[in-house]
């Protein structure tokens, strides 16, 4: 009986530390500001590092600019997004700006985006400062399902801080689906 | 059989449950704002209450000004900042402010800081209104090894609010490191 | 001996299965436009949706304008809440703004209110501007026992943005109370 | 594909009036600063007019400057330069560009239109 | 306004040939600078932008170089299809000048 035991308890252990690590995907990915669009209006960023600094990702897939979820469950969802601009840079095309982020939602299978949350300030940066800086920051608690794609939106992308610490998004699951 | 059976059962409710507990460590810090800095230059804030109103922590150790990691693991990382000024404090030295938080990471093995996360904004701060404000809020998940260390830089810290509710920050374990 | 350690591995994972979905309470409830107090002042939202879009709740109760707490434990609490104008929408009374968001706890028991965390900004929206918005974002980790309500306090609630993915606040159950 | 398309011009008589127009495509067009520049016949080119992607901000080169007037319809995707008070010197055709920064100023013009010419003669 | 002076106006080179041109700001423009191609009855064709980035699907040949007053386009081996002409194009405060133009032809 103390055999079997051991074994109900070892093969336990192994269930449980092994549903535990499996149930609890999560990923943290940092702005690649190598390819960062220069537009000024609402364009998805598809460069994110995965695996460098404090880049990273576990069962969950970044693909095609899309943090891809690869388990059902629900998910504390977070973004966080610094715009900056420096008077070296040059001169700003307008003074009023609308820095903006949205974190949206795609499904595959009915082929639809919806945004989850969104954030972000008016802004009037003048010419007045050599150096001006606004962080956004957005999260909060989702149900996501197998295949369903989470990507980020902006505004004034070219106005992104390319730091780790600054321009990041992320998510980790907290529980299953009933 | 039974009795074997009760004893299994008893003892992984036993495990389950010290597991589950050892395996979250948590804290949430609020400022001290009897020795907050004076200037308006960026600097480490040391003085918060780990016991008292919101405060609180576990599996954690709060020392030095610095919140001591006790256990490897995956942990969510926050904090909320806000800054004040009325004109009743007395004029501004400048109207213009960087008002900035860092999240920084110190590892002791190898004597080093890193910044996990920032936000925060420039603001115009006129004398035209006699109440100012701004909150900033930042949060990320990092993976933490036991005797690193999470500490909060602030720029202008003479403006920090010093209400439990308004500048806080903190951490929860939410996964074991595979 | 097979069969009993079946039933073991069985009433275990039942047992796992039901103490982590009981242990999990979570609520992310999205703001309900029809019905936004009107002024300037501070008031508690009493109207948020709990079962359309994203909004969703599970072991927790949604009643009289607060979310309730039904099994005690330590949560992670958060809120997003977005306002905005546009010239459109008329003249402001004033300019100068203070846009704020209280995350408040109450106790039945002890009939009393406490904030928890509080977040915003004043602003300047002048009418150089056609359109403005901003965006408050704040987060923590709190101790809640069954039977307290948390609720949401804004300032200027006309200007609030009524989208679901701009005005939420929520909570999710990280672990148990020691 | 990305493109501009030019349409308007003509021939007018001194102190007439015309009104440019540039279609775009293939592009976000609100979220682009676009200018004006015409070239003279036989001569170099010369800077006309710029407008901010949102329109707020609007520059003009000294020699235009109370007399045209640029504006732009994000709806439509269109930009436009209205000419009031025409010279024989502005005599030219005119080239729609776009700023190669949606945000800042000074990285220079990426894609043109085809021209149109505008002939002020009595 | 910032005048801006191109030299030479005409410039005579062979296929193979490497190529020089300068553009000269009255005052200090810092980095704005553009260059442009342009063939006869065409739109101009941006090159270079912020005085040494090169557009995009733009051949390697060409670059730039310079900053504050005194900027160079550099075609490294000329090609038949380079005969054209090169403008330098400044941006500062709120301001946009061509320069006259440098028409490289057929020695």
């Known amino acids: 009986i103390r055999a079997e035991k051991a074994m109900v308890d070892g093969s336990w252990l192994d269930l449980a530390k092994r549903s535990k690590l499996e149930a609890q995907p999560f990923a943290h990915l940092t702005i690649n500001a190598t390819d960062i669009p220069s537009g000024s209006h609402k364009v998805s960023l598809s460069s994110w590092y995965h695996d460098r600094g404090w880049a990273k990702i576990s069962n969950m897939t970044f693909s095609n600019g899309k943090l891809i979820v690869n388990q059902d469950g629900f998910y504390y969802l977070y973004a966080n997004i610094c715009f900056r601009h420096h008077e070296t840079s040059g001169d700003l095309a307008t003074e009023y700006l609308q820095l903006m982020v949205y974190v949206t939602k795609t499904s595959i299978k009915i082929p639809s985006s919806h945004t989850l949350m969104k954030g972000g300030s008016t802004k009037y940066w003048s010419g007045n400062s050599e150096f001006h800086f606004y962080s956004i920051n957005v999260g909060g608690f989702f149900k996501l399902r197998s295949g369903e794609e989470i990507s980020i939106e902006v505004s004034n992308p070219s106005l992104l801080d390319p730091d780790q610490d600054a321009t990041y998004f992320g998510a980790f699951k907290v529980r299953d689906i009933d | 059989i039974r009795a074997e059976k009760a004893m299994v059962d008893g003892s992984w409710l036993d495990l389950a449950k010290r597991s589950k507990l050892e395996a979250q460590p948590f804290a949430h810090l609020t400022i001290n704002a009897t020795d907050i800095p004076s200037g308006s230059h960026k600097v480490s804030l040391s003085s918060w209450y780990h016991d008292r109103g919101w405060a609180k922590i576990s599996n954690m150790t709060f020392s030095n000004g610095k919140l001591i990691v006790n256990q490897d693991g995956f942990y969510y990382l926050y904090a909320n900042i806000c800054f004040r000024h009325h004109e009743t404090s007395g004029d501004l030295a400048t109207e213009y402010l960087q008002l900035m938080v860092y999240v920084t990471k110190t590892s002791i093995k190898i004597p080093s800081s890193h910044t996990l996360m920032k936000g925060g904004s420039t603001k115009y701060w006129s004398g035209n209104s006699e109440f100012h404000f701004y909150s900033i809020n930042v949060g990320g998940f990092f993976k933490l090894r036991s005797g690193e260390e999470i500490s909060i830089e602030v720029s202008n810290p003479s403006l920090l609010d010093p209400d439990q509710d308004a500048t806080y920050f903190g951490a929860f374990k939410v996964r074991d490191i595979d | 001996i097979r069969a009993e350690k079946a039933m073991v591995d069985g009433s275990w994972l039942d047992l796992a299965k039901r103490s982590k979905l009981e242990a999990q309470p979570f609520a992310h409830l999205t703001i309900n436009a029809t019905d936004i107090p009107s002024g300037s002042h501070k008031v508690s939202l009493s109207s948020w949706y709990h079962d359309r879009g994203w909004a969703k709740i599970s072991n927790m109760t949604f009643s009289n304008g607060k979310l309730i707490v039904n099994q005690d434990g330590f949560y992670y609490l958060y809120a997003n809440i977005c306002f905005r104008h546009h010239e459109t929408s008329g003249d402001l009374a004033t300019e100068y703004l203070q846009l704020m968001v209280y995350v408040t706890k109450t106790s039945i028991k002890i009939p009393s209110s406490h904030t928890l965390m509080k977040g915003g900004s004043t602003k300047y929206w002048s009418g150089n501007s056609e359109f403005h918005f901003y965006s408050i974002n704040v987060g923590g980790f709190f101790k809640l026992r069954s039977g307290e309500e948390i609720s949401i306090e804004v300032s200027n609630p006309s200007l609030l943005d009524p989208d679901q993915d701009a005005t939420y606040f929520g909570a999710f159950k990280v672990r148990d109370i020691d | 594909q990305v493109q501009l398309v030019q349409s308007g011009g003509g021939v007018v008589h001194p102190g007439r009036s015309l009104r440019l127009s540039c279609a775009a495509s293939g592009f976000t067009f609100s979220g682009y600063g676009m200018h004006w520049v015409r070239q003279a016949p036989g001569k170099g080119l010369e800077w006309v007019a710029v407008?901010?992607?949102?329109?707020?901000?609007?520059y003009y080169a000294d020699s235009v400057k109370g007399r045209f007037t640029i504006s732009r319809d994000n709806s439509k995707d269109t930009l436009y330069l209205q000419m009031n008070s025409l010279r024989p010197e502005d005599t030219a055709v005119y080239y729609c560009?776009?700023?190669?920064?949606?945000?800042?100023w000074g990285y220079g013009m990426d894609v043109w239109g085809q021209g149109t010419t505008v002939t002020v003669s009595s | 306004d910032i005048q801006m002076t191109q030299s030479p106006s005409t410039l005579s080179a062979s296929v193979g040939d490497r190529v020089t041109i300068t553009c000269r700001a009255s005052?200090?423009?810092?980095?704005?600078l553009a260059w442009y191609q342009q063939k006869p009855g065409k739109a101009p064709k941006l090159l270079i932008y912020k005085a040494s980035s090169l557009e995009s699907g733009v051949p390697s040949r060409f670059s730039g170089s310079g900053s504050g007053t005194e900027f160079t386009l550099t075609i490294s081996s000329l090609q038949p299809d380079d005969f054209a002409t090169y403008y330098c194009q400044q941006y500062n405060s709120y301001s946009w000048t061509f320069g006259q133009g440098t028409k490289v032809e057929i020695k």
């Open positions: 005052q200090s423009i810092s980095s704005w």
């Open positions: 407008i901010s992607y949102d329109g707020t901000n609007k």
């Open positions: 560009a776009k700023c190669l920064s949606g945000t800042y």
